[in-house]
């Protein structure tokens, strides 16, 4: 979490931020709060990519003013227009690119002040693990999949059971490059796998880490998988 | 409630050009992309392109640019579609839509009626 | 440019089928794929954006799935007014492209 606040001239205003990931080729958000204002006509606000000439977003006076976006940004952000009001000026990204990476400021203006705070933007790819038996395999084996990752993550395997056992010896990784040549598909395979045990598929890379569990017993299989972005800090 | 109402029928002569009109109202204009797409007879849709009135900022199909021209009348809410050098496979109906997600170019949630150009001799 | 191809380009059903129909990127990968419906005479009524996400007021038998290149609109029981043309739509680049269109005829 960054906190800023105005400087010189008028009277300051706490903006906050919160660092976030974009996973490439969907949406992205952009988090800014401030403290809010009774008139949406005096609220103004900027978003500013460090590096970039234009500015990423513009909204003053009820509206977007879009004059000096810079052009990688064009036609690919929004704020959230009726909550500015409340003190949000979070703004949306469309289609995220790897190139979207970097420094952001949001810059407030109100009637009460001025402030602003910095934002790490990191990008990559990242997806839900799924962890299936593989019955195609001749002893019994579990094969854990996850469609989109960027960087190359790292896989471990863990046991319930096995606590602190290490199946580096008894699993197999691979990354298989998808079609666009830059986010890889994970694919694990774990050999000799015992029933009434529950396994965890852990991916992990710089902005994410997901888990795949499968609980295998005679009679049935279940499977949870959660994922945790780990870099949200606010500013 | 969102309405793009669209120009009447208009009817050319190969190498003329012609001018259609979307006026739209129920929003603010100027926040919103508004796209063009045709329809040729018995054939499928195909995007001419899109501007932001707000702004005045365009993107256009190859296949169209310098023959296609967006404009957009922020005083009357009114965008324009005008295609030069007209010829028979021209003969479409040409659709304004607004896209979703204000100054975020997003799907074409809100159609205009259509306008039918014929291109004959 | 990206190209969606588009499949099959017609299909007869009968009432109470399942019904799906593909799209496929010529490249890249996004979410920005969306589906529309249209009727003969009429402009194209959106059903749905960002690959899965149903418009207000569509009926829930509508649902898009897809990643990647591969794009799914899939009808889980057909009813007497989804007889239609369907298009899919990639919106996620700066030039936009259609789907050559599927035309669900009835059996």
């Known amino acids: 979490l960054i906190i800023g606040f105005g400087i010189s001239g008028r009277h300051s205003i706490t903006v906050t931020t919160v660092a976030s990931a974009g996973n490439i080729g969907e949406d992205g958000i952009l988090s800014c709060t401030f403290e809010p204002d009774i008139k949406l006509s005096d609220i103004v606000i900027q978003w500013l990519k460090e590096g970039v000439l234009g500015l990423v977003h513009e909204f003053k006076e009820g509206k977007d003013e879009l004059s000096e976006q810079d052009e990688m940004f064009r036609g690919r952000t929004a704020v959230f227009a009726d909550q500015v009001i409340v003190g949000n000026a979070s703004l949306r990204l469309k289609n995220v690119q790897l190139t979207d990476a970097g420094t952001y400021k949001c810059y407030i203006i109100t009637s009460k002040g001025k402030g602003n705070a910095n934002l790490e933007y990191k990008t990559g790819a990242f997806s839900m693990p799924e962890v299936n038996v593989d019955y195609n395999a001749s002893s019994e084996t579990l094969r854990c999949e996850a469609p989109r990752w960027f960087p190359q993550p790292t896989v471990v395997w863990a046991s319930q059971v096995d606590q602190g056992a290490n199946f580096s010896e008894v699993s197999n990784t691979s990354f298989e490059l998808n079609s666009e040549n830059v986010t890889m598909k994970v694919v694990s395979v774990l050999y000799n796998v015992t029933i009434n045990n529950t396994y965890s598929c852990m991916i992990e890379n710089d902005i994410a880490k997901a888990t795949g569990d499968i609980k295998v017993t005679e009679s049935e299989i279940k499977r949870r998988s959660h994922l945790q972005l780990l870099n949200s800090k606010a500013s | 409630e969102v309405q793009l109402v669209q120009s009447g029928a208009e009817v050319k002569k190969p190498g003329a050009s012609v001018k259609v009109s979307c006026k739209a109202s129920?929003?603010?204009?100027?926040?919103?992309?508004i796209g063009w797409v045709r329809q040729a007879p018995g054939q499928g849709l195909e995007w001419i392109g899109d501007?932001?009135?707000?702004?005045?900022?365009?993107n256009y199909n190859e296949k169209f640019k310098g023959r296609a021209t967006l404009t957009a009348d922020k005083s009357t809410s009114t965008a324009y579609l005008e295609l030069s050098s007209l010829r028979s496979e021209d003969t479409a109906v040409y659709y304004c839509?607004?896209?979703?997600?204000?100054?975020?170019?997003?799907?074409?949630?809100?159609w205009g009626q259509g306008t039918l150009v014929t291109v004959s001799s | 440019d990206i190209q969606m191809t588009q499949s099959p380009s017609s299909l007869s059903a009968s009432v109470g089928d399942r019904v799906t129909i593909t799209c496929k990127a010529s490249?890249?990968?996004?979410?920005?794929v969306a589906w529309y419906q249209q009727k003969p005479g009429k402009a194209p009524k959106l059903l749905i954006h960002?690959?899965?996400t149903l418009q207000p007021g569509i009926p829930s038998r509508f649902s898009g799935s897809g990643s990647g290149r591969d794009y799914t609109l899939t009808i889980s029981s057909l009813q007497p007014e989804d007889f239609a043309t369907y298009y899919c739509l990639q919106y996620g680049n700066l030039l936009y492209a259609f789907g050559q269109g599927t035309k669900v005829e009835i059996k």
């Open positions: 960002y690959t899965s």
């Open positions: 501007i932001y009135p707000g702004g005045g900022y365009t």
């Open positions: 490249q890249g990968f996004n979410k920005y």
């Open positions: 839509a607004r896209l979703d997600g204000s100054s975020y170019r997003g799907a074409m949630d809100s």
């Open positions: 129920g929003y603010t204009f100027t926040s919103y992309w």
